[in-house]
Interface confidence: low
Amino acid sequence: DTEIKVNPPQDFEIVDPGYLGYLYLQWQPPLSLDHFKECTVEYELKYRNIGSETWKTIITKNLHYKDGFDLNKGIEAKIHTLLPWQCTNGSEVQSSWAETTYWISPQGIPETKVQDMDCVYYNWQYLLCSWKPGIGVLLDTNYNLFYWYEGLDHALQCVDYIKADGQNIGCRFPYLEASDYKDFYICVNGSSENKPIRSSYFTFQLQNIVKPLPPVYLTFTRESSCEIKLKWSIPLGPIPARCFDYEIEIREDDTTLVTATVENETYTLKTTNETRQLCFVVRSKVNIYCSDDGIWSEWSDKQCWEGEDLSKKTLLR
């Protein structure tokens, strides 16, 4: 029996379409596939950012694959051809690996890139990113922010920069249609007359950096002689009620009585007849049903009841 062999894919390359980290891995069929015309050839693709311990592995019949990478580091990938056992009357046959790498030649020393990049998606509506200039740059340095997510034809530059001393230190984004639950790519590069500036790349998903508005319209309602119901309204905006967690802080006569996390817009509190003053504040956060992470809102305005009999039927501000 002659040993069945197959060649690796040809022209394996990583192509950067200018999407700030979303790259195309593409290849052509191997040479000499004539013997296997009745066969569906498969490809095993492995790729990772250089420095990562684990490879991502994909098996596909296609001649391309797309994924997001961290362009602050290089990328390495390898691919080989797989002939399924149905094609070889026996065990699966694999070709040798074809390998390729990709990286953006870094310009400038690391100290010139932006520091402390911070992005917040306020109320799931307004994205704002801010940064500090690199520690090794002069005042003539200016930074530019570009962004892309799937659905945009090409990367867009920020059009509404936040400035300090003439330098761009942040970006207010326009309305970002259909931009959540997918990777959002950002590049902040820079220019200076005196020295090259290192670019920085960032990737996140918008639903994971949401900071909601605080809850509003806090009220008290007496439920029974020893129970008071605290109620509030969800903040306005596109975040549905099912997506909120709340943290309540309740003070009775200047002593912190309760800190609790709840999922609805009510909380029932046991009280005593001796209570003279009751105050509470609430804050909100997107919960695990709608995101993997989030940022607590500011605390609501404090709502207090004092100086009157707490056994009244309804206590409203």
Epitope: Q125, Y175, L213, V216, Y217, L236, G237, P238, D301, K302, R317
Partner: antibody, heavy 119, light 111 residues
């Protein structure tokens, strides 16, 4: 409880100015805008403008832009609205009204100040 | 400026009746998925009271019989079962654009 207490009624002559105050209590003053709304006798409501109690930023109705000035004193949690070059059609009850943000409505109102412009 | 047209300008109704007041804006008052439309109740000699904000959200402590609906340019305030204390004048108000503007009012009287 949230309270907005306005200054008392005024009778002023045409061409003069009036300054109405609105003292807030029972909430974090600088977290809110203060709006001013007027109502002529037997008429509807008319928005004059608003001031951000934190930054002092103002948004005026163009109709009053050249005659109105709104100011804030955070040390006393008081907002002022001054209207100049008064004429008889400025006779109205002037209200201050608290607002958290554009979409939240004016949720607490002062008791109103009657300004009568008469010679 | 955005004009608001309320109808009817007045109506007579009895206790227990279902009352509907409409407000039409000269252009859309929607933005970012929010309708910037509010409803107020005013009794003679008193300051207005917020009933509904953002078209359908109830103000603090308002009775459940008051409800708001609508989006874009057409909005409705409904009182599901009129009570004696509900006889008053009702105003719609937009806060999408400065200057904020009010409807002309609807006076609800006892039949």
């Amino acid at each position: 409880q949230v309270q907005l207490v306005q200054s008392g009624a005024e009778v002023v002559k045409p061409g003069a100015s009036v300054k109405v105050s609105c003292k807030a209590s029972g909430y974090t003053f600088t977290n809110y805008w203060m709006n001013w709304v007027r109502q002529a006798p037997g008429q509807g409501l008319e928005w004059i403008g608003r001031i951000d109690a934190y930054a002092g930023e103002t948004h005026y109705n163009q109709k009053f832009k050249d005659r109105v000035t709104m100011t804030v004193d955070t040390s006393t949690s008081t907002v002022y609205m001054e209207l100049s070059s008064l004429r008889s059609e400025d006779t109205a009850v002037y209200y201050c009204a608290r607002g958290y943000g554009d979409a939240y409505g004016m949720d607490h109102w002062g008791q109103g100040t009657l300004v009568t412009v008469s010679s | 400026d955005i004009q608001l047209t309320q109808s009817p300008s007045s109506l007579s109704a009895s206790v227990g009746d279902r009352v509907t007041i409409t407000c039409r804006a000269s252009e859309s008052v929607d933005n970012y998925g929010i309708s910037f439309m509010n409803w107020f109740q005013q009794k003679p000699g008193k300051a207005p009271k917020l009933l509904i904000y953002a078209a359908s959200r109830q103000g603090s402590g308002d009775p459940a019989r008051f409800s708001g609906s609508g989006s874009g340019t057409d909005f409705t305030l409904t009182i599901s079962s009129l009570q004696p204390e509900d006889f008053a004048t009702y105003f719609c108000q937009q806060s999408k654009e400065v200057p904020w503007t009010f409807g002309g009012g609807t006076k609800v009287e006892i039949k």
